[in-house]
Interface confidence: low
């Protein structure tokens, strides 16, 4: 005999107490797949969480973080405090990046400046707490007689692609 529960669509549950009838999920619950015997309770976005997508009968609510916080983990399971650019979050709160490191985002850790000399290049623009150094041509390229017809390409900000 075919299991009648398999015919219950998303948004319903198979209620065995009612001879395997598909009952719509009660308010504040959902089933995202067919054939479910229970509906799951909707996630509530409270405190540092705010609602990005309301719960429906077929899909759970989705949360974001309130202003000043950012999501961490799968499906924004945690909210972490934002810091300013040039800072990183430590156990004692937001701290400025140490000399020789930078962070160009409101999250994450401070990273060391690029070592231009490893690529045989020179520092064109010094690094800051918020920005990495910009490497320019190698010192040899800048010696007298070297062609300077094409200036170095302007540095792109991280995350930006060429137009």
């Amino acid at each position: 005999l075919q299991d009648l529960c398999s015919n219950c669509p998303a948004g319903t549950f198979c209620d065995n107490n009612r001879s395997q009838i598909c009952s719509p999920c009660p308010p504040n619950s959902f089933s995202s797949a067919g054939g479910q015997r229970t509906c799951d309770i909707c996630r509530q976005c409270k405190g540092v969480f705010k609602t990005r997508k309301e719960c429906s009968s077929t899909s759970n609510a989705e949360c974001d973080c309130i202003s000043g916080y950012h999501c961490l983990g799968a499906e924004c399971s945690m909210c972490e405090q934002d810091c300013k650019q040039g800072q990183e979050l430590t156990k004692k709160g937001c701290k400025d990046c140490c000399f020789g490191t930078f962070n160009d985002q409101k999250r994450g850790i401070c990273r060391p400046w690029t070592n231009c000399s490893l690529d045989g290049k020179s520092v064109l623009v010094n690094g800051t707490k918020e920005r990495d150094v910009v490497c320019g041509p190698s010192p040899a390229d800048l010696s007298p007689g070297a062609s300077s017809a094409t200036p170095p390409a302007p540095a792109r900000e991280p995350g930006h692609s060429p137009q």
Partner: antibody, heavy 116, light 107 residues
């Protein structure tokens, strides 16, 4: 405010197909089911099926499974119902209505006339 | 499919009276019943959800009751603007079904 806009009337020849529209406004389109309901002149209401724009999941009344096809266009917040192989029995007012259980907002209905 | 039987087909009352509409389901459906009003040439309007929950914007003279298989829509102090067809609808299982409707007339 919530609104569901439907064209007033459609005239189609027997054997042809028609695509009825229902443009939603005043709420988040992807968060609510859109239902379609048929009403023949002087008759009661008949549920055709529904679609959830958030994941395009559909449920159909078995009687309409080969007759109706439900789709949505998220970019324009519009739901569509395509009716195929039309006969005089398909002449009716077709309503779209928002809601998962209680149908809380209804369009004005499209009067479909199937006639040669 | 769940069959909803509405009775009577026509109800005739005088203004100011109380009127009750009946809806009987072919199987136990808890409280998953809605009631709609449809005036002549108009779209249906949701009056009551989950058998007895009232909705904002609906006059308080409309009320619903019942569970299991027997449900009732009542209107206190009927007014002339209540002339319409009244339908029950179940949301217990697919496909959703409507009753055949009861027409309210004013004497």
């Amino acid at each position: 405010q919530v609104q569901l806009q439907q064209p007033g009337a459609e005239l189609v020849k027997p054997g042809a197909s028609v695509k009825l529209s229902c443009k939603a406004s005043g709420y988040t389109f992807t968060n609510f089911w859109i239902n379609w309901v048929k009403q023949r002149p002087g008759q009661g209401l008949e549920w055709i099926g529904n679609i959830y724009p958030g994941n395009t999941g559909t449920n159909y009344n078995e009687r309409f499974k080969t007759k109706a096809t439900l789709t949505v266009d998220i970019s324009s917040s519009t739901a569509y119902m395509r009716l195929s192989s039309l006969t005089s029995e398909d002449s009716a007012v077709y309503y779209c209505a928002r809601g998962q259980l209680g149908l809380d907002y209804w369009g004005q209905g499209t009067t479909l006339t199937v006639s040669s | 499919d769940i069959l909803l039987t509405q009775s009577p087909a026509i109800l005739s009352v005088s203004p100011g009276e109380r009127v009750s509409f009946s809806c009987r389901a072919s199987q136990i459906i808890g409280t998953t019943i809605q009631w709609y009003q449809q005036r002549t040439n108009g779209s249906p309007r949701l009056l009551i959800k989950y058998a007895s929950e009232s909705l904002s914007g609906i006059p308080s003279r409309f009320s619903g009751s019942g569970s299991g298989t027997d449900f009732t829509l009542s209107i206190n102090n009927v007014e002339s603007e209540d002339i319409a067809d009244y339908y029950c609808q179940q949301s217990h299982s697919w496909p959703f079904t409507f009753g055949s409707g009861t027409k309210l007339e004013i004497k």
